[in-house]
């Protein structure tokens, strides 16, 4: 709860310009859901549904709420202390190496493989070789022989939120 974020912790695009940096109020930082005023004297609320801050901080601005893309569903809305939680729609997933977009799950496994894991919002279907049991990371199933699957039921949120 009492972790704190200062200007230095932010990504460059979220950081205030150097001349805007102010010291915290002598009594401490501003609570989650707030940012510090320009003169460093007051704490100002983030705007509900528009921006947020998650920790005690000396930010001059709250962080802008994420808007879920088309192809995503909103699991929980943005509050003053928590970013929006977005999740890929059923039948699509978000890969760690391309978190910016939801990709369609494969409909089946290549020849000689069996499905051991369903499509979830954070992973494609999982296929293993029938004999060896080793996982397959290939993209395109062989057309001649596929094991079809229906999209899995989402089990837990996959969030890009801060």
């Amino acid at each position: 709860e009492s972790a704190l974020i200062t200007q230095q912790d932010l990504a460059p695009q979220q950081r205030a310009a150097p001349q805007q940096k102010r010291s915290s109020p002598s009594e401490g930082l501003c609570p989650p859901g707030h940012h510090i005023s320009e003169d460093g004297r007051d704490c100002i609320s983030c705007k509900y549904g528009q921006d947020y801050s998650t920790h005690w901080n000396d930010l001059l601005f709250c962080l802008r709420c994420t808007r879920c893309d088309s192809g995503e569903v909103e699991l929980s809305p943005c509050t003053t202390t928590r970013n929006t939680v977005c999740q890929c729609e059923e039948g699509t997933f978000r890969e760690e190496d391309s978190p910016e977009m939801c990709r369609k799950c494969r409909t089946g496994c290549p020849r000689g493989m069996v499905k051991v894991g369903d499509c979830t919002p954070w992973s494609d279907i999982e296929c293993v070789h029938k004999e060896s049991g080793t996982k397959h990371s290939g993209e395109v199933p062989a057309v001649e022989e596929t094991v079809t699957s229906s999209p899995g039921t989402p089990a837990s949120p996959c969030s890009l939120s801060g």
Partner: antibody, heavy 121, light 107 residues
């Protein structure tokens, strides 16, 4: 059940100090800010300041900076407010209050019962 | 500091009437407004926060509305137990400030 139990009424002399207490129960003491609010007889409400037991962060209303001192004792889950150099203007009911569950917005669903401070000559 | 002005110190009403209590902020407070009810000898009780969100257990005859600088607490059908003092409060910026209060009285 969240409860804020405040100390009893005080009759004090002008120029002296008084220390009021607010004992919290029913929640994790270090996770929530405690605010103090003043109400003079037949008048409105004034925000004095906050104390955050999690880090010791304090914020005062400038108007009360030289009047109130906020402290806490984590072991007894109690926040204190000391009022110094008392005058008749300090005669009032003082409330402690706690903010909402889901965030840190300063609207107050939980209030102590209030402590009446009477300053006499 | 942000000044919260409740223009009516007193409002007379009858049981069953609809009544609106107004509050004006000296600057935009982005819907960060709460409303409290206070009865004699009691602590304030929150009714509404974020301008329009009703607190748990508050009867639905109490409704909050407004944005920018102008906010309203409406009681759709006043009950005898609603006779009390009502305060608005901005929770937008420190120092948090309250309106002067509006006392709801029976005609």
């Amino acid at each position: 059940k969240v409860q804020l139990q405040q100390s009893g009424a005080e009759l004090v002399k002008t120029g002296t100090s008084v220390k009021l207490s607010c004992k919290a129960s029913g929640y994790t003491f270090t996770e929530y800010i405690i605010h103090w609010v003043k109400q003079r007889s037949g008048q409105g409400l004034e925000w004095i300041g906050w104390f955050y037991p999690g880090s010791g962060s304090i914020k005062y209303n400038e108007k009360f900076k030289d009047k109130a001192t906020l402290t806490a004792d984590k072991s007894s889950s109690t926040v204190y407010m000391e009022l110094s150099r008392l005058t008749s203007e300090d005669s009032a009911v003082y409330f402690c209050a706690r903010h909402e569950e889901g965030g840190y917005s300063a609207w107050f669903p939980y209030w102590g019962q209030g402590t009446l401070v009477t300053v006499s000559a | 500091d942000i000044v919260m002005t409740q223009s009516h110190k007193f409002m007379s009403t009858s049981v069953g009437d609809r009544v609106s209590i107004t509050c004006k902020a000296s600057q935009d407070v982005s819907t960060a407004v709460a409303w409290y009810q206070q009865k004699p000898g009691q602590s304030p009780k929150v009714l509404i926060y974020w301008a329009s969100t009703r607190h748990t257990g508050v009867p639905d005859r109490f409704t909050g509305s407004g944005s920018g600088t102008d906010y309203i607490l409406t009681i759709s059908s006043v009950q005898a137990e609603d006779l009390a003092l009502y305060y608005c409060q901005q929770h937008y910026s420190t120092p948090y400030t309250f309106g002067g209060g509006t006392k709801l009285e029976i005609k």
